[in-house]
Amino acid sequence: MMTGTIETTGNISAEKGGSIILQCHLSSTTAQVTQVNWEQQDQLLAICNADLGWHISPSFKDRVAPGPGLGLTLQSLTVNDTGEYFCIYHTYPDGTYTGRIFLEVLESSVAEHGARFQIP
């Protein structure tokens, strides 16, 4: 039975040209995290393997940085970066947990972070 929940940074916004940290946290389970995949809608951004470390997709090598922790830092943001991001936790023995973050990249200088929320 999957008992864990993923807490994410929720709905967030950031300025064009700036950076943002995407964070997820798996709680309420003793399952071992073997790997975390970060996806942007249709694209695989990065992989963090518990034993082997990080790999960034060649498509995003220049704009994505690993961390902090199991999170992901997006740099040089453009309006096209607006959309859904998913952290996919591969765990043993539970299986897969997925968290969702919605990022809005704003042209203006007003960019406020949204509240945290949980996805079971």
């Epitope: 790997q35 809608q41 249709d42 694209q43 695989l44 992989i47 393997n49 082997l52 470390g53 790999h55 997709s57 060649p58 498509s59 090598k61 591969h90």
Partner: antibody, heavy 119, light 107 residues
Amino acid sequence: EVQLVESGGGLVQPGGSLRLSCAASGFTFSDYYMYWIRQAPGKGLEWVAYITKGGGSTYYPDSVKGRFTISRDNAKNTLYLQMNSLRAEDTAVYYCARQTNYDFTMDYWGQGTLVTVSS
Amino acid sequence: EIVMTQSPATLSVSPGERATLSCKASQDVGTSVAWYQQKPGQAPRLLIYWASARHTGVPARFSGSGSGTEFTLTISSLQSEDFAVYYCQQYSSYPLTFGGGTKVEIK
């Protein structure tokens, strides 16, 4: 059992077009990123195209950019490679391959289909 | 583009002996390197990913090492089925590139 079966290869004249297909089975096709790789006779491997799970993004090397188009039909579990303005140097065995779900490497390959560009 | 240079082009080894294959990248690729085995008339088979991780079902006699620009594939004790061509590949940046291959033949 994972299977990738390429088809559509053959003899084509320089400047001509060809469409390759890769029928996938034994796994949930829409959950995987896919590649086309080619190998000229007696030569090494060359990456040709990459497509994301839903088909929204594609990537190519300069050698085929603007001439080749990778696409997919997830409802039909099929990957395609449309090849236009073919040149003699495009002669090769073309393989479709599946990206692993834990890395950016290719864990399953088809047996390939031969494309010969010659007049 | 990142050039992957493999050496030697051909390696003659007796069954039971150790084989060491080299792959050098023209720039730092971290650990974004894979090794594939290809036998005549067959498609390539993934052996090693992440420079040192063995793919599922790959025998323990195959091991990979290295990071940055220098990588090694070692076959600890060659079996008859290991005689083939081996390719390294980098997936650090586009275009994805392969080495020219090392043919491991029976001595």
